[in-house]
């Protein structure tokens, strides 16, 4: 008799793929307009990325550092009207994209939570949650919670409101902290909270260090659902050397949890891509017309248009990974096992029951090496085969689809591989 199938875990929509942050509408649209109506026109693009949720804003009225002039129930007219927002929600729903609204109160000001009047602000947030839930929003984000006094208890209260409305509503908290203990104390008091932090950007970007960060985090959080990003708001390029971008895309999409990206991460957008632009709001490079000030040779391969036409581009890799992440059970909710790793590299297996299994091998170093993978530290349920099929490499030149001998596996500098192999009873 065939072994009994494992019961599938309950999967919320944010478990099924990546979240995509658009913190600055003007930067994202890159055409000087930057409003909700314009954003609607980019939903097809977001669909093509197979992202499950759009983390939007903040877009509410906020007079810099003025509590009274901050209204979380009103959309800043520069971004559009409530009707525009309702229309965006409706269009997004049709494309199965959920909208998560950033309600960080004083986003234009010095201290995101104002330095005083914490209770007043917390009440405003509470009212806003109830208001926007009724309006059809799928979730909320609040950032810089290290600046919010008694953050844990407020988050618990806000979580109760969102979950009380529906189990299908999400609350994301963001912190600049990279300290595991601080992160854990925030998570402990809030079940189901998705927390973005600077935890991974605390890395020296070696395979050994990244492996220890990831495994420590997973061990400490137990079977709680994680999110993976390098910061609560910034671009990957602000934290990573360029040669590791592809590697991190592969890792973020294949670790157990929800990957969270900022607009532009999919094309390797850099914060100062266009001179004169503020670092926090880089202009999204849709095509060559996004380069009003520079005519850099090869600028086409930095744009969405250019990269869409190139199967070897970062954008193409992002799309492929996002697609795999959203449809393969082992990547959706599979178990995770790290393998013993050599210098500069980190490898792990994702597996779920009798479904196809995935092996990820990441070489963070700039020296090619023999990975020589052996299953010495794996449980029987996750045993390694002699060969696995190459699904993708982060670098050109590999023969995708071909079987690779795992004991003789050799990686190029900064290369990541995603391999697949079948369950064998």
């Amino acid at each position: 008799r065939a072994p009994r199938c494992r019961d599938l875990p309950v999967q919320k929509w944010w478990h099924t793929g990546a979240l995509y942050r658009i913190g600055d509408l003007q930067g994202f649209q890159g055409n000087g307009a930057g409003n909700l109506a314009g954003l609607k026109g980019h939903l097809d693009y977001l669909s093509s990325l197979k992202v499950k949720g759009l983390v939007l804003g903040p877009i509410h009225k906020n007079q810099k550092d003025d509590v009274a002039g901050t209204d979380l129930l009103q959309i800043d007219p520069n971004f559009g009207s409530k009707e525009d927002f309702a229309s965006l929600l409706q269009s997004a729903k049709k494309k199965s994209i959920r909208i998560i609204l950033d309600l960080t109160p004083n986003y234009q000001g010095e201290n995101s939570w104002f330095s005083t009047q914490v209770d007043t602000v917390a009440t405003k947030v509470k009212d806003a949650l109830e208001f926007w839930l009724q309006a059809g929003v799928d979730g909320f984000q609040v950032r810089d919670i290290e600046n919010l006094k008694d953050a844990s208890s407020f988050l618990a209260e806000w979580q109760n409101i969102t979950k009380g409305f529906s189990e299908d509503r999400l609350l994301i908290a963001g912190t600049n902290s990279s300290d595991l203990q601080q992160i854990l104390s925030l998570l402990e008091s809030n079940k189901d909270l998705l927390l973005t932090s600077s935890y991974l950007s605390n890395s020296s970007f070696t395979g050994e260090h990244t492996k220890s960060l990831v495994t420590q985090y997973l061990n400490a959080t137990g079977n709680r659902w994680c999110s993976w990003s390098l910061s609560q708001a910034g671009l990957l390029t602000s934290f990573l050397p360029a040669q590791l971008l592809r590697l991190y895309q592969l890792m973020l999409f294949t670790l157990p949890g929800t990957p969270v990206f900022s607009y532009g991460d999919e094309i390797g957008l850099e914060a100062a891509a266009v001179p004169g632009q503020p670092v926090e709001a880089p202009v999204m490079l849709w095509d060559e017309s996004s380069f009003p000030f520079i005519s850099a040779a090869g600028s086409a391969n930095m744009t969405v248009k250019g990269q869409s036409e190139d199967p070897g581009s970062l954008l193409s890799l992002f799309r492929r990974l996002s697609d795999q992440r959203s449809k393969e059970r082992s990547l959706l909710h599979g178990d995770f096992h790290a393998l013993s790793s050599g210098p500069g590299f980190f490898s792990y297996i994702r597996h779920w029951d009798q479904n196809e299994r995935f092996l990820v091998v990441l070489n963070f170093g700039d020296v090619g090496l023999s990975a020589g993978l052996q299953a010495s530290d794996l449980p029987a349920s996750a045993s390694l085969p002699a060969k696995a099929d190459l699904l993708l490499s982060t670098q050109p030149g590999r023969d995708e689809g071909s079987p690779l001998e795992l004991e003789r596996l050799k990686l190029e500098p900064h290369e990541g591989l995603l391999l697949r192999f079948p369950y064998v009873a």
């Epitope: 050599g342 210098p343 090619g368 090496l369 003789r408 050799k410």
Partner: antibody, heavy 120, light 111 residues
Framework: EVQLVESGGGLVQPGGSLRLSCVAS????????MHWVRQAPGKGLVWVSR????????RYADSVKGRFTISRDNAKNTLYLQMNSLRAEDTAVYYC?????????????WGQGALVTVSS | QSVLTQPPSVSGAPGQRVAISCTGN?????????VHWYQQLPGTAPQLLIY???DRPSGVPDRFSGSKSGTSASLAITGLQAEDEAAYYC???????????FGGGTKLTVL
Amino acid sequence: EVQLVESGGGLVQPGGSLRLSCVASGFTFSSYWMHWVRQAPGKGLVWVSRINSDGSIIRYADSVKGRFTISRDNAKNTLYLQMNSLRAEDTAVYYCVREGRYTGSSLDYWGQGALVTVSS
Amino acid sequence: QSVLTQPPSVSGAPGQRVAISCTGNNSNIGAGYDVHWYQQLPGTAPQLLIYGNSDRPSGVPDRFSGSKSGTSASLAITGLQAEDEAAYYCQSYDSSLTGWVFGGGTKLTVL
């Protein structure tokens, strides 16, 4: 057939400069990391410098840091080594070397070498 | 003084087996970096003989084999032939020097 041909070697006085070139053929030059390795007369091999495929990642041996500069022109399939403030101990045959792919960063093809003599 | 230590010379009669050792430390071979071997015939440029500890490039006879264990590696040549007379170099990467390192070379004499 893979070929690496060095040129630019010669006699130079201490403190002087020299620029070595290496023209590559028989492979897609722009896809490979490249190295310079030297060998003093009657001695062993010593690694000098390495550059990645697009020129954005560069490494030097401590003995040449600040004096030598590696660069490449992928359009011309050419690797360069600019050597300044030369010393007597820099006297050697300089080999242009290709780093293999999927070989654990081994050095899979070597040029015939260019002799650099630093003497007054 | 080379970072990787090789015997300066080894010798053997035709048909015999010889082995050349290469000893490093925990920042190169012992750290898990690959060891490669090169053959340099008199008056010529070096040629890759073994890569990735034990793999042979095409064209290299199977009389040549490589192995690695801990902080050292070894090159074995069986069925020694006159044309094997050459200098042999091991090479790895060193993380503390952040560079490629070679052994001092071993001169093989076929008696």
